[in-house]
């Protein structure tokens, strides 16, 4: 029900990557505005994005307080220019979001190969430890800081002259692999959280190849 000129939000969807978290919904407002509330299962509701005509709301600041909590959001609809107006039940129309647990559900952002260094027939490939918006003691935590032992990286590597890929895995942000002397190799990495049931893998990093600027070659 509600007032004749407001419609409830629908298709409430969490969009989250490396804990940057935005709630999106429909429809685009016509003569109405929205306010979002967010809470943990046991907590109080906190209002965000007051009387907005947007159909998204950045809730990052709230969820990074504890990324292991489960959050619920709701979107209220109000008539434009008359936000005091309520529905027939005495309150504005609203719709609930699905529950969202950032630690278990945020997408893993595309990783970046920070560097690679060849020493003889070994190559050390280092993955950039991306900073998140999660804070502890006033410092931003890296992806590794947050996910710890739950986060692994998979390295895909192949000779520039062929298409046959090999893989390696690491529980740190570094790989040490064996390569053939005199061959150039290309590399791509992927972040993985094996214990997850959803959003287990990131997209692959951009490909980096030996003989280009990122790496360093030392003949020993």
């Amino acid at each position: 029900s509600g007032t004749t000129n407001t419609v409830a939000a629908y298709n409430l969807t969490w969009k989250s990557t490396n804990f940057k978290t935005i709630l999106e919904w429909e429809p685009k407002p016509v003569n109405q505005v929205y306010t979002v509330q967010i809470s943990t299962k046991s907590g109080d509701w906190k209002s965000k994005c007051f009387y907005t005509t947007d159909t998204e709301c950045d809730l990052t600041d709230e969820i990074v307080k504890d990324v292991k909590q489960t959050y619920l959001a709701r979107v209220f609809s109000y008539p434009a220019g008359n936000v005091e107006s309520t529905g027939s039940a005495g309150e504005p129309l609203y719709e609930n979001s699905p529950e969202f647990t950032p630690y278990l559900e945020t997408n893993l952002g595309q990783p970046t190969i920070q560097s690679f260094e060849q020493v003889g027939t070994k190559v050390n490939v280092t993955v950039e430890d991306e900073r998140t918006l999660v804070r502890r003691n006033n410092t931003f935590l890296s992806l590794r800081d947050v996910f710890g032992k739950d986060l692994i990286y998979t390295l895909y590597y192949w000779k520039s002259s062929s298409s046959g890929k090999k893989t390696a895995k690491t529980n740190t942000n570094e790989f040490l692999i064996d390569v053939d002397k005199g061959e150039n190799y290309c590399f791509s990495v992927q972040a993985v959280i094996p214990s997850r049931t959803v959003n287990r893998k990131s997209t692959d990093s951009p490909v980096e190849c030996m003989g280009q600027e990122k790496g360093e070659f030392r003949e020993i």
């Epitope: 647990t101 996910f147 710890g148 740190t172």
Partner: antibody, heavy 121, light 109 residues
Framework: QVQLQESGAEVKKPGASVKVSCKAS????????IEWVRQAPGQGLEWMGE????????KYNEKFKGRVTMTADTSTNTVYMELSSLRSEDTAVYYC??????????????WGQGTLVTVSS | QAVVTQEPSLTVSPGGTVTLTCRSS?????????ANWVQQKPGQLPKGLIS???NRGPWTTARFSGSILGDKAVLTLWGAHTEDEAVYYC?????????FGGGTKLTVL
């Protein structure tokens, strides 16, 4: 506050199975690994395995693979550890534990009160 | 499986400083081993002191400090009290499993 409440003492015969429960409260159950650790009389601590309730992902100590099963019931915030084909050497106090924070603080911060399992014919 | 080695026993005087070490049979201990230190007093439950190498639990007194020194994980206790007498266990993470050391019996005498 975080609490882990374990089930009561059990006496089992060799060859039987035992299922120990650990009911969690005071935190978001699905997001934290629960560890199972045992301690035989007068001995040190021995890690048995772990489970992440939100995904039911498990990791087991090779020593117990095939004999141990860990499960989680998210409707009751309870984790279970079942150990089969019991022998006298399995007589021990069985603890569940949880880490303190996320990320680099994985491990064994909060502990249950322990469940004594006695295997005797 | 890896073996984690600790000193079987150590003695410290009240008010003194003592260092407990934790070695890995596979090589140097790193932050990726997420070293834990667990205290167990006689007849009591284990209690987590340090996790992730150097993170104190909210109940852990500042007299305890965790670190990596060279190739070992280290628990340092400053200003030892008689109530610190306990067995201290180290646990290290190896890719997909934890391994506990045999424990160090600390006597404050």
């Amino acid at each position: 506050q975080v609490q882990l409440q374990e089930s009561g003492a059990e006496v089992k015969k060799p060859g039987a199975s035992v299922k120990v429960s650990c009911k969690a409260s005071g935190y978001t159950f699905s997001s934290y690994w629960i560890e199972w650790v045992r301690q035989a009389p007068g001995q040190g601590l021995e890690w048995m395995g772990e489970i992440l309730p939100g995904s039911a992902s498990t990791k087991y100590n090779e020593k117990f693979k095939g004999r141990v099963t860990m499960t989680a019931d998210t409707s009751t915030n309870t984790v279970y550890m079942e150990l089969s084909s019991l022998r006298s050497e399995d007589t021990a106090v069985y603890y569940c534990a949880r880490d303190y924070y996320y990320g680099s603080s994985y491990g064994f911060a909060y502990w249950g009160q322990g469940t004594l399992v006695t295997v005797s014919s | 499986q890896a073996v984690v080695t600790q000193e079987p026993s150590l003695t410290v005087s009240p008010g003194g400083t003592v260092t407990l070490t934790c070695r890995s049979s596979t090589g140097a201990v790193t932050t990726s081993n997420y070293a834990n230190w667990v205290q167990q007093k006689p007849g009591q439950l284990p209690k987590g002191l340090i996790s992730g190498t150097n993170n104190r639990g909210p109940w852990t007194t500042a007299r305890f400090s965790g670190s990596i020194l060279g190739d070992k994980a280290v628990l340092t206790l400053w200003g030892a009290h008689t109530e610190d007498e306990a067995v201290y266990y180290c646990a290290l993470w190896y890719s997909n499993h934890w391994v506990f050391g045999g424990g160090t019996k600390l006597t404050v005498l």
